[in-house]
Amino acid sequence: MAVTACQGLGFVVSLIGIAGIIAATCMDQWSTQDLYNNPVTAVFNYQGLWRSCVRESSGFTECRGYFTLLGLPAMLQAVRALMIVGIVLGAIGLLVSIFALKCIRIGSMEDSAKANMTLTSGIMFIVSGLCAIAGVSVFANMLVTNFWMSTANMYTGMGGMVQTVQTRYTFGAALFVGWVAGGLTLIGGVMMCIACRGLAPEETNYKAVSYHASGHSVAYKPGGFKASTGFGSNTKNKKIYDGGARTEDEVQSYPSKHDYV
């Protein structure tokens, strides 16, 4: 029950996180015009990964896409790549985790396969979350660098006669959405990995094989020890030898509902 809850919660948290990563990637407010200690303008500038926008006092908002690819800063391209990789991994992770959910029955899929899928999706969520956090952090670092550079030469002009106020940019809402979303996806991934451990069948049974000797003495020989990790095929223990001896596994048994936590 606890495993199902952990897996389900991990899935929901990751789902919210990935939705947040998608939202952050699409948002226009990655950087917004710094209004503090600046001349008050009748226009408000803000920029996203894909376009820059200007909202005028009149209420009119004009957005322009970055139609060039080669002309864009390498850092912006890197952030775009990280966010897209995060979304793609997260989406695949979600798809895998849907089939891995313990509460969803798909044919005769064994728990070990579900454990595998849960771990895979968990790792994907972790990487997805890390990509988003990295992308947002790289952009934030770029902003901080540019902010102090533009503060250093706040006013530029010809001999101080004509002043051009440089527009400074600060953190936009998308950065906070991205950080939170990345964190949620990461937490969801960790929860899925924890759930995977509970899903894996712990077949730590000591197999015993008994055979009747031709004499009056009875020999007891311990069979092969198998600790199942839940990965790979769930192969049955082989017979040690055929001479009338039978392993316990040859009598086909399915795990009962009490076998796992």
Epitope: V40, V54, S57, T167
Partner: antibody, heavy 120, light 113 residues
Framework: EVMLVESGGGLVKPGGSLKLSCAAS????????MSWVRQTPEKRLEWVAT????????YYADSVKGRFTISRDSAKNTLYLQMLSLRSEDTALYYC?????????????WGQGTSVTVSS | DILMTQSPSSLSVSAGEKVTMSCKSS????????????LAWYQQKPGQPPKLLIY???TRESGVPDRFTGSGSGTDFTLTISSVQAEDLAVYYC?????????FGAGTKLELK
């Protein structure tokens, strides 16, 4: 047709108060940014205040800050300018203006104006 | 505050003449975000409110004759009337639409010779 009609002007003593009104019609009043601009007897144009459409943020000229208040009643399609502690330098013709939504913050419509005279 | 300086303060012209008036701002009115200039030109005839002629430094307001042309960028702007008509006799104001407080120039008065 867009129309802006100002009212409420008159003669007032220094330190007195006055409330100007601007009745708007012919457009979706609530979504437009509105301003008050005054023209002094010397024919100089001075921006007084602005109220942003939708958001309701307000901006004031330093000379009127703390004394004048711009507000709007979207239900009545009316813009107001509450003027307190009036001074002789506030004597002017007050225009109600609309900022065009595609006109780069320019004032595309102006009312005929209402006259305010501050004198003892 | 942004200072808007208009020159000349008055102009005497004959009908059909080409007229150019200047407006200079103390700070650039060019927005880096969209590369647009936030400057407007208004025409005011006696006894009337000002009328918008040009916005964004160079875009003609609808209904404005094409003899009116706005140009310039950053801090230096110009309004040109290619062939002055009798109905163009008025006072022309430029306005900073970029910074609060929104400021106007003192105006250029266009008179007949």
């Amino acid at each position: 047709e867009v129309m802006l009609v100002e009212s409420g002007g008159g003669l007032v003593k220094p330190g007195g108060s006055l409330k100007l009104s601007c009745a708007a019609s012919g457009f979706t009043f609530s979504s437009y940014t509105m301003s008050w601009v005054r023209q002094t007897p010397e024919k100089r144009l001075e921006w007084v205040a602005t109220i942003i459409g939708g958001y309701g943020n307000t901006y004031y000229a330093d000379s009127v800050k703390g004394r004048f208040t711009i507000s709007r009643d979207s239900a009545k399609n009316t813009l107001y300018l509450q003027m307190l502690s009036l001074r002789s330098e506030d004597t002017a013709l007050y225009y109600c203006t609309r900022l065009g939504q595609t006109q780069r913050n320019a004032m595309d419509y102006w009312g005929q104006g209402t006259s305010v005279t501050v004198s003892s | 505050d942004i200072l808007m300086t208009q020159s000349p303060s008055s102009l005497s012209v004959s009908a059909g003449e080409k007229v150019t008036m200047s407006c200079k701002s103390s700070q650039s009115l060019l927005n880096s975000g969209n590369q647009r200039n936030y400057l407007a030109w208004y025409q005011q005839k006696p006894g009337q409110p000002p009328k918008l002629l040009i916005y964004g430094a160079s875009t003609r307001e609808s209904g404005v004759p094409d003899r009116f042309t706005g140009s310039g960028s950053g801090t230096d702007f110009t309004l040109t009337i290619s062939s002055v008509q009798a109905e163009d006799l008025a006072v022309y104001y430029c306005q900073n639409d970029y910074y609060y407080p929104l400021t106007f120039g003192a105006g250029t008065k266009l008179e007949l010779k």
